[in-house]
């Protein structure tokens, strides 16, 4: 049943004498495995024998025996899927029909494959895109309907017989659908490639020539132009004539229109290959080119720079920068249209020629106020001298100059006076708009440049003003020389260096920080009583009674100033000690008796010690000694001792009498 056999393979295979052929092939025998395979050359069916006649190129039987002469032809298939064949080498007389006779247990089939073997290697085929345009990348394809594993080949590209630099990509196909070798070359043709011959050359593995295919490139491109000018350097003077000619060196397809452009703009009514310019003017200077178009697009020639020479035009001056700040640098630029460029310049400041200035630029590194004014220039070239233009104004700005602070008051100034000062200056550009004063204070400015200080302070030593436009210029400070009463008067202990103990020699100093005028007098007082008129107050042997509040006064011709009251503290050991008794020096037994150690001491007593009539120390440390309950045996004389950081003091004896209670008397 023929429907059970399905084959896939190329319909025709191509090769040449001495090469090889590889036949990719698949099949499906649905009733079982292949049992017998015969490869016929040009098989013919014999009706008498019901068998095929023809040359048997390959035969494989059930026992697997293969005749020894069949080494050239190989069956590379299997019993159920693969029917691939190889003939190596292949001969011219192998051309024709190959018949694959397949037999399974119950079925038979003859499959036919065409084989075309040429005497010599057949040429590959070059495929080009329908249109090639300059600078547009195209792919050139070279195709050969041959590929065989046992016979390697290569395809090489040549341009005008020279190998092409571009890398080609070669691919092969050996499948049941197709057998071929293909080379693809990506290439960006230029207009110069038009008409050139491209070759695809088939070579064997050693690079030996086998065959080739050639094509002529048809590269579409815009017109390629050359421009010629008379005179050749394109330099003329006003009134001369100029001729420009446009020549087409290549165009594919043919050109259709011609035009001329100046500085990129089309010239009207100029549509021939020659451009005639008569009696040129300087305005006709510029860049000229011709433009020729075809179906691909317009082509342009190189530009010709036409220079029409003329004498300098009236000049203008550009200043970098005005207004200029004094001390900065300024550059003047003389601008004058001329061809050729001016070779010499003459500069003028306020109409007067500036000696030694012949350049296009004048640079002044450090501008001074006298540099202000009008600057003009004249330019000169080989064709003549230009006219002097209107010129440019340089404004030189500078801070106010010679600023001074002036005191308007009569001298001397006393603390508390109202002082008026003015701020004067010599010149300024721009005008002075404001004033500043140092130091800052809550002061009045009744008018511009005038300062009024109400109630002037003793410490207002100097005042400086600044006159300001865009900048401030400060005057030298002016001394107010304010007179005032002595300041910061205070009492200072000179000796002893440490605390004052009773009996010490003591010196107190009356200090003050400043006085203007400097001549002063001193006064010492305690509790409103005058003690002395020297800067020092001395005690040969201080006593606690000297303690108290002391003040000193310092006066000058302006006034007098008192110190803060200064407390003189005298340290002394406890004195005037006595023992007081509460509720009294006679107490009934069983009650409470409190003994208090009273004293006068500076610093206060820090430690008390109590003693009885036998000078026995009692274990109490407080100012008060409490006996509770008091006993008759506690009757006797007690005394205390007080201690501070200076020393010790002791009290006289105080007698405590403890009498019997009525209960005790009753019991007796």
């Amino acid at each position: 049943d023929s429907s059970k056999w399905v084959f896939e393979h190329p319909e025709t295979l191509y090769a040449w004498e001495g090469a090889c052929v590889w036949i990719p092939c698949t099949y499906r025998a649905l009733d079982g495995d292949l049992e017998s395979f015969i490869l016929f050359h040009n098989p013919e069916y014999n009706k008498n024998t019901s068998k095929f006649d023809g040359t048997r190129l390959y035969e494989s039987t059930k026992d697997g025996k293969v005749p020894s002469e069949q080494k050239r032809v190989q069956f590379l298939g299997d019993k159920n899927k693969n029917c691939t064949l190889s003939i190596h080498p292949v001969h011219l007389n192998d051309s024709g029909q190959l018949g694959l006779r397949m037999e399974s247990k119950t079925e038979k089939w003859m499959e036919r494959i065409h084989l075309n073997v040429s005497e010599r290697p057949f040429p590959p085929h070059i495929q080009l895109p329908p249109e090639i345009q300059e600078s547009q990348e195209v792919t050139l394809t070279c195709l050969l309907n041959f590929s065989c594993y046992g016979y390697p080949i290569q395809l090489q590209w040549l341009l005008e017989g020279v190998p092409m630099r571009q890398a080609a990509v070669t691919s092969t196909s050996l499948t049941i659908k197709s057998v071929f070798t293909r080379s693809e070359l990506k290439f960006s043709p230029q207009w110069s490639h038009h008409g050139k011959i491209v070759t695809c050359q088939l070579q064997d593995a050693d690079g030996k020539f086998l065959s080739n295919d050639t094509v002529q490139l048809n590269v579409k491109h815009t017109p390629k132009l050359e421009i010629k000018v008379t005179p050749s350097d394109a330099i003329v003077r006003e009134g001369d004539s100029v001729t420009m000619t446009c020549e087409v060196s290549s165009s594919n397809p043919e050109y259709t229109t011609v035009s001329w452009l100046k500085d990129g703009t089309s010239l009207k009514k100029q549509n021939t290959f020659t451009l005639n310019l008569r009696e040129v003017t300087k305005d006709q200077s510029g860049k000229y080119c011709c433009q020729v178009s075809n179906d691909v697009g317009p082509g342009r020639s190189e530009e010709v720079f036409l220079q029409v020479q003329y004498a300098p035009e009236p000049s203008t001056v550009q200043i970098l920068h005005s207004p200029a700040v004094e001390g900065s640098q300024v550059e003047f630029l003389c601008m004058s249209l001329a061809n050729p460029l001016p070779t010499n310049y003459t500069w003028y400041h306020n109409g007067k020629e500036m000696q030694g200035r012949t350049e296009e630029k004048v640079h002044i590194p450090k501008i001074l106020p006298w540099h202000a004014g009008t600057y003009s220039c004249v330019a000169e070239n080989i064709l003549g001298t230009g006219q002097r233009g209107p010129g440019a104004e340089l404004d030189v700005q500078y801070p106010p100059k010679k600023v001074t602070t002036v005191i308007q008051n009569p001298m001397p100034i006393r603390e508390g006076d109202t002082v008026t000062l003015s701020c004067n200056y010599n010149s300024s550009n721009p005008s002075v708009t404001r004033y500043e004063w140092k130091p800052h204070g809550a002061w009045e400015e009744p008018s511009l440049g005038v300062l009024k200080i109400q109630n002037v302070g003793w410490d207002n030593t100097t005042i400086a003003c600044a006159a300001c436009n865009s900048w401030c210029s400060w005057a030298s400070p002016v001394a107010l020389n304010v007179q005032y009463a002595p300041r910061d008067v205070r009492v200072r202990k000179i000796k002893p260096l440490s605390e004052i103990h009773s009996g010490n020699s003591v010196s107190l100093q009356c200090d003050f920080s400043s006085s203007h005028p400097k001549e002063v007098q001193f006064f010492w007082e305690k509790n409103g009583r005058l003690l002395g008129k020297e800067s020092q107050l001395n005690f040969d042997s201080i006593s606690p009674e000297d303690a108290g509040s002391y003040s000193c006064w310092v006066n000058n011709s302006i006034g007098q100033t008192a110190s803060k009251a200064w407390t003189l503290e005298v340290l002394y050991a406890p004195r005037r000690l006595r023992v007081s008794m509460s509720p009294g020096d006679q107490v009934m037994e069983g009650k409470s008796a409190t003994l208090t150690c009273e004293s006068d001491a500076n610093p206060p007593v820090s430690h008390y010690t109590w003693f009885d009539w036998n000078n026995q120390s009692l274990p109490y440390h407080s100012q008060k000694l409490r006996l509770e309950p008091v006993k008759v045996q506690h009757s006797g004389a007690y005394w205390c001792q007080g201690t501070n950081s200076v020393g010790k003091g002791r009290s006289p004896l105080s007698t405590l009498t403890v009498y019997y209670s009525p209960e005790t008397i009753g019991r007796r």
């Epitope: 009885d612 009539w613 026995q616 009692l618 409490r626 509770e628 506690h634 006797g636």
Partner: antibody
Framework: EVQLQQSGPGLVKPSLTLSLTCAIS??????????WTWIRQSPSRGLEWLGR?????????DYAVSVKSRITINPDTSKNQFSLQLNSVTPEDTAVYYC???????????WGQGTLVTV | QSALTQPASVSGSPGQSITISCTGT?????????VSWYQQHPGKAPKLMIY???NRPSGVSNRFSGSKSGNTASLTISGLQAEDEADYYC???????????FGTGTKVTVL
Amino acid sequence: EVQLQQSGPGLVKPSLTLSLTCAISGDSVSSNSATWTWIRQSPSRGLEWLGRTYYRSTWYNDYAVSVKSRITINPDTSKNQFSLQLNSVTPEDTAVYYCAREGSGSYYAYWGQGTLVTV
Amino acid sequence: QSALTQPASVSGSPGQSITISCTGTSSDVGGYNYVSWYQQHPGKAPKLMIYDVSNRPSGVSNRFSGSKSGNTASLTISGLQAEDEADYYCSSYTSSSTLYVFGTGTKVTVL
């Protein structure tokens, strides 16, 4: 070396009197440079100074304000000891009672072994 | 008379230093230089460690030191050792009728 040996009952009924004795060795109760003190310690009140007795030209006593109305501290020169009596006791008086010696300074260098008294 | 205020507990690792504070008033700690410190191990009587603010009785390690500033006294134990773990009490003479006042006590733990 001064040593203090305490004696007295460990259990006292409420409202009765707590009595403890502290026997002195290595010093005299009549020393005119020492004082003899009772201190107690309980979890609720910590260490608490109760009072002291001492001899200078005569005998003196000082008592803490908290127990002044109930306390008596007496020296016994014949036995070289001193005693504590605390009247009208309550469970609040439950504590460890210590006798201690104060020397010439205000500190306690010598202590008895302590007696736990439970009311 | 209120007890002097001490921290309830202070702890330190062996070799470290710790300080215990004792705060009173001008009537006790601040008014007199009669501050003493006592160490008490469980079940034992207190032991004098420092007297008159900063003096050490013979037999007490020089790792123990005392000081006073204003109404606050301090005990410092340097080079802490395991045997230093105990309760510590301060005490001061006072101008009230109750002549002596003790601190609330501080438990020292050696970690």
